[in-house]
C-alpha cells in the first residue's frame, strides 16, 4: 500500500511539475522591465523565449515573435533547448509511469517490469526537472549579467532588440514558475525511484529447501529471519516516503486606488 501511495504521489507531483514546465516555457514573462528607475512609465516591456511584448497603460498589448532563428543569441537558444528537452523527457516519463503504476493492471505484466518502468520514468523526471532548473537558471544568469549593462544601443541578448538607456530587465514570473515546476518534477522523480525499490521482488541466489516432517509442511528459507507456512505471503514493512512541495501563487500587484504620478 505504501509503495502504491509513494508511486502515485510521485506521478501526481511529476505531472504538476511537467505542466508547470510547459506553462513556464510558453509564458511571455521570462524577463520584465525593471521599474526601479522609472516607476511611472506608461509603457511596460516584457519578454519570453518566443516573443517580446509591450503593454501600454491604455491596456493595449502588442507581442512580436522572434521570427529569426540564426539571429538569436546562443544562450537563448540553449534555454529553449533545455526547456524542450525537459518537456519531451517529462512527457515520455509520464507515459512510461502510467503503465508502471501499481494500481493499473495491464495484461500479465510482472512486478519486475513495473519496477523497471517506474525507475525509468523516475530517472526521466529527475533529468526533466534538472533540465528545467538549468534552463531557468541560465536565463536568470543572463539577466543578471545584462542588468547593469543597459547602455545605449546595447545588444540585450533577447531577439536582437536595441535597448535605450532607461530600459533594464529583471526576473519575470516564468522564472519562478520554472524553478518551482522543475523542483516538483525532480521530487516526483525521486519518489518514483524510491517506489521502484519497493516494487522490485527480492531475488535470492539459493532455492528454498523444504524439509518434510511428519506434521505440518513448513518451508525454511536460508539467510532469512522469516519463516513461512507456505500458504500466506510474507508481509514487508516499508516506510512511506511522502515528498511534499509547496508552490507559491504569483501575486500580481495592481496599482492602488490612489496612485499619484
Amino acid at each position: 500500500m505504501a509503495v502504491t501511495a509513494c508511486q502515485g504521489l510521485g506521478f501526481v507531483v511529476s505531472l504538476i511539475g511537467i505542466a508547470g514546465i510547459i506553462a513556464a516555457t510558453c509564458m511571455d514573462q521570462w524577463s520584465t522591465q525593471d521599474l526601479y528607475n522609472n516607476p511611472v512609465t506608461a509603457v511596460f516591456n516584457y519578454q519570453g523565449l518566443w516573443r517580446s511584448c509591450v503593454r501600454e497603460s491604455s491596456g493595449f498589448t502588442e507581442c512580436r515573435g522572434y521570427f529569426t532563428l540564426l539571429g538569436l543569441p546562443a544562450m537563448l537558444q540553449a534555454v529553449r533547448a533545455l526547456m524542450i528537452v525537459g518537456i519531451v523527457l517529462g512527457a515520455i516519463g509520464l507515459l512510461v509511469s502510467i503503465f508502471a503504476l501499481k494500481c493499473i493492471r495491464i495484461g500479465s505484466m510482472e512486478d519486475s517490469a513495473k519496477a523497471n518502468m517506474t525507475l525509468t520514468s523516475g530517472i526521466m523526471f529527475i533529468v526533466s526537472g534538472l533540465c528545467a532548473i538549468a534552463g531557468v537558471s541560465v536565463f536568470a544568469n543572463m539577466l543578471v549579467t545584462n542588468f547593469w549593462m543597459s547602455t545605449a544601443n546595447m545588444y540585450t541578448g533577447m531577439g536582437g532588440m536595441v535597448q535605450t538607456v532607461q530600459t533594464r530587465y529583471t526576473f519575470g514570473a516564468a522564472l519562478f514558475v520554472g524553478w518551482v515546476a522543475g523542483g516538483l518534477t525532480l521530487i516526483g522523480g525521486v519518489m518514483m525511484c524510491i517506489a521502484c525499490r519497493g516494487l522490485a521482488p527480492e531475488e535470492t541466489n539459493y532455492k528454498a529447501v523444504s524439509y518434510h516432517a511428519s506434521g505440518h509442511s513448513v518451508a525454511y528459507k536460508p539467510g532469512g529471519f522469516k519463516a513461512s507456512t507456505g500458504f500466506g505471503s510474507n508481509t514487508k514493512n516499508k516506510k512511506i516516503y511522502d515528498g511534499g512541495a509547496r508552490t507559491e501563487d504569483e501575486v500580481q500587484s495592481y496599482p492602488s486606488k490612489h496612485d499619484y504620478v
Epitope: T41, N45, C53, V54, E56, G59, V162, T164, T167, Y254
Partner: antibody, heavy 118, light 113 residues
Framework: QVQLVQSGAEVKKPGASVKVSCKAS????????MNWVRQAPGQRLEWMGQ????????KYNGNFKGRVTITRDTSASTAYMELSSLRSEDTAVYYC???????????WGQGTLVTVSS | DIVMTQSPDSLAVSLGERATINCKSS????????????LTWYQQKPGQPPKLLIY???TRDSGVPDRFSGSGSGTDFTLTISSLQAEDVAVYYC?????????FGGGTKVEIK
C-alpha cells in the same frame, strides 16, 4: 458611434468643490481608461488623472496634490471628476477623454467650463 | 515630469504651402521593446475639444487626411502639413505618451498668410 457628453458649465467660489460628469456611449465603458484633462485660458493642456471603470483603479497627476478625485458609475456608463479647494487659477475648460492605443486620447467630451470667482 | 517644448509658437503659411511644427521632449520617448516613439499630435480648433491626428509619432488616426504626417525619434519630432488647407487653421499640440504624468506641449497656432 463613440460619444462623451459632459455636464454643463459651473460657477464656484474659492475653497468650494466642483464635480463634473462625463457620460459615455457607443463603446464598452468598462474596457477603456477614462481621462480628465483641463485647459486654462491661454495655458497648455494639463492631464489630471484617469480611471479604469472595470475595477475602479485610478492614477492621478501629483501636481494637483490630492485635490482631484475621479470616480465612476459603471451602471450609468458615467465618469466623474471632483476638484476640491478651488482657486481662481482652476478656472478652465475640463475635458474627459478616452484612452486608446498608443496611450493617446482618441475621443473627447465637449468640455465643461468651470469658473472660480469670488 | 517630461517637459514638451513646441516651436514656433505661431506659424503663418500660404494656402497649399507646407507647414512644419517641431516638438522637443526633455527625455527620450522611444520605447526599446517595440521601437515605437510614444508621441501624439492633436489639432484643436477654436471652441472645440482637441482632435487626435497622429500617435506613435507617425501613425495617422483613421479619417485623418494624408497631408498630415509625423516624423522624428527619441526627443525630436515634427508634424508636417504638406499642403495647407483653410480647414487646417488651428492650434496643434504634441503630447508625451511615454511616462506619467502625461504632458502636453504649449501648442503651435497655424494661420493662413
Amino acid at each position: 458611434q463613440v460619444q462623451l457628453v459632459q455636464s454643463g458649465a459651473e460657477v464656484k467660489k474659492p475653497g468650494a468643490s466642483v464635480k463634473v460628469s462625463c457620460k459615455a456611449s457607443g463603446y464598452a465603458f468598462s474596457n477603456y481608461w477614462m481621462n480628465w484633462v483641463r485647459q486654462a485660458p491661454g495655458q497648455r493642456l494639463e492631464w489630471m488623472g484617469q480611471i479604469y471603470p472595470g475595477n475602479g483603479d485610478t492614477k492621478y497627476n501629483g501636481n494637483f496634490k490630492g485635490r482631484v478625485t475621479i470616480t465612476r458609475d459603471t451602471s450609468a456608463s458615467t465618469a466623474y471628476m471632483e476638484l476640491s479647494s478651488l482657486r481662481s487659477e482652476d478656472t478652465a475648460v475640463y475635458y474627459c477623454a478616452r484612452y486608446y492605443r498608443g496611450n493617446c486620447f482618441d475621443y473627447w467630451g465637449q468640455g465643461t467650463l468651470v469658473t472660480v470667482s469670488s | 515630469d517630461i517637459v514638451m517644448t513646441q516651436s514656433p509658437d505661431s506659424l503663418a503659411v500660404s494656402l497649399g504651402e507646407r507647414a512644419t511644427i517641431n516638438c522637443k521632449s526633455s527625455q527620450s520617448l522611444l520605447n526599446s521593446g517595440n521601437q515605437k516613439n510614444y508621441l501624439t499630435w492633436y489639432q484643436q480648433k477654436p471652441g472645440q475639444p482637441p482632435k487626435l491626428l497622429i500617435y506613435w509619432a507617425s501613425t495617422r488616426d483613421s479619417g485623418v487626411p494624408d497631408r498630415f504626417s509625423g516624423s522624428g525619434s527619441g526627443t525630436d519630432f515634427t508634424l508636417t502639413i504638406s499642403s495647407l488647407q483653410a480647414e487646417d487653421v488651428a492650434v496643434y499640440y504634441c503630447q508625451n505618451a511615454y511616462t506619467y504624468p502625461l504632458t502636453f506641449g504649449g501648442g503651435t497656432k497655424v494661420e493662413i498668410k
